[in-house]
């Protein structure tokens, strides 16, 4: 019965495999919000090339809770959201700072998820005695993808399948822990 007080408006569902969010609205209790990154790509001269590798986009960090039915994660997870217009890597950070955007003429460059990581989260469920856990797929990095007007939509739909077939060996591997240890951890969280 007291669960409603514990659950708040900041609770959001982390999408399951193949579902990726638009940048979410501002959430309550976000700790490391809106850190803009340039995707780690090397700097290049802003106007000399239209090669997709020359462009970068913003990676925003959002802290949120994972929910599944009435269950909520014991701790929030940090989710990366790919956001904004893609621009030349050297120009983009300055352009953001000045509140200006560089827009490429011709093809559209979209900021989309590049790599994913799976994370195990402990869930607290009202009335539940069993220790619950859930795997969630989180965006690990973003990339600029060049989209022409002919295949704009299909390209965007296409990264759902890309997510369903992630490449192996991308996740950090936690050391093995017994289910009993998980149970103790969850019981302590109640």
């Amino acid at each position: 019965q007291g669960w409603q007080a514990f659950k708040n408006d900041a609770t959001e569902i982390i999408p399951e495999l193949g579902e990726y969010p638009e940048p979410p609205p501002e959430l309550e209790n976000n700790k490391t919000m809106n850190r803009a990154e340039n995707g780690g790509r090397p700097p290049h001269h802003p106007f000399e090339t239209k090669d997709v590798s020359e462009y970068s986009c913003r990676e925003l960090h959002f802290t949120r809770y994972v929910t599944d039915g009435p269950c909520r994660s014991a701790k929030p997870v940090t989710e990366l959201v790919c956001s904004g217009q893609c621009g030349p890597a050297r120009l983009l950070p300055n352009a953001i700072g000045r509140g200006k955007w560089w827009r490429p003429s011709g093809p559209d460059f979209r900021c989309i998820p590049d790599r994913y990581r799976a994370q195990r989260v402990q869930l607290l469920c009202p009335g539940g005695e069993a220790p619950r856990a859930r795997k969630v797929r989180l965006v690990a990095s973003c990339k600029c993808k060049r989209l022409t007007r002919f295949h704009n939509q299909s390209e965007l739909k296409d990264f759902g399948t890309e997510a369903a077939r992630p490449q192996k060996g991308r996740k950090p591997r936690p050391r093995a822990r017994s289910a009993k240890a998980n149970q103790a951890e969850l019981e302590n969280a109640y």
Epitope: D68, C125, G127, A130, R134, K135, V136, A164, R177, A179
Partner: antibody
Framework: EVQLQQSGAELVRSGASVKLSCTAS????????VHWVKQRPEQGLEWIGW????????EYAPKFQGKATMTADTSSNTAYLQLSSLTSEDTAVYYC???????????WGQGTTVTVSS | DILLTQSPAILSVSPGERVSFSCRAS??????IHWYQQRTDGSPRLLIK???ESISGIPSRFSGSGSGTDFTLSINSVESEDIADYYC?????????FGAGTKLELK
């Protein structure tokens, strides 16, 4: 598309052991929990246990402790169920399934029929 | 272990009818109940989770309700493809357990 492909039917002698496999395609097996469920002829479903292939964590139903052993090999994207000291009570269809959570079952394999002969 | 009792064992319906399946838990389990459909010679598939939460890809004629000890799965207009066995499963405590199932058949 998420799919779980189970190994073929097994006919085994009483007292022997059998090892069933469940190979995932369309996703990495370590990104899910893998559960095993038993269904005897004309009967309901019994949960055997789950394994987290990422790190080998397991949880067994008390009834199946000592009878069933769950393992996983992430390099081949495959989970295994070994059943030992087989009796006629172990004649059943065994399903593997992949779940986002360790407490309900999202995707099911097609099942493997195990027949124990005396 | 939590015992789940499903009733009736067999339900006979005509296409287009509304039908309800009952699942009763031996102790209060909140909304920690999930429903599965198993067609003849097929594998089970998840229909509803947490008593009432719909699953992507499952027709909207399937719905669930209940909390505590009494739960219901409903099909608001039965189609021939719905002829199957239906199982409830609890996730309130280990071990996870299933009901014995209800068989849906055509009149």
């Amino acid at each position: 598309e998420v799919q779980l492909q189970q190994s073929g039917a097994e006919l085994v002698r009483s007292g022997a052991s059998v090892k069933l496999s469940c190979t995932a395609s369309g996703f990495n097996i370590e990104d899910y929990y893998v559960h095993w469920v038993k269904q005897r002829p004309e009967q309901g479903l019994e949960w055997i246990g789950w394994i987290d292939p990422e790190n080998g964590d397991t949880e067994y139903a008390p009834k199946f402790q000592g009878k069933a052993t769950m393992t996983a090999d992430t390099s081949s994207n495959t989970a295994y169920l070994q059943l030992s000291s087989l009796t006629s009570e172990d004649t059943a269809v065994y399903y593997c399934n992949g779940g986002y959570g360790n407490f309900y079952f999202d995707y099911w394999g097609q099942g493997t029929t195990v027949t124990v002969s005396s | 272990d939590i015992l789940l009792t499903q009733s009736p064992a067999i339900l006979s319906v005509s296409p287009g009818e509304r039908v309800s399946f009952s699942c009763r838990a031996s102790q209060s389990i909140g909304t920690n109940i999930h429903w599965y459909q198993q067609r003849t010679d097929g594998s089970p598939r998840l229909l509803i989770k947490f008593a009432s939460e719909s699953i992507s890809g499952i027709p909207s004629r399937f719905s669930g309700s209940g909390s505590g000890t009494d739960f219901t799965l409903s099909i608001n207009s039965v189609e021939s493809e719905d002829i199957a066995d239906y199982y409830c499963q609890q996730s309130n405590s280990w071990p996870l357990t299933f009901g014995a199932g209800t068989k849906l058949e055509l009149k």
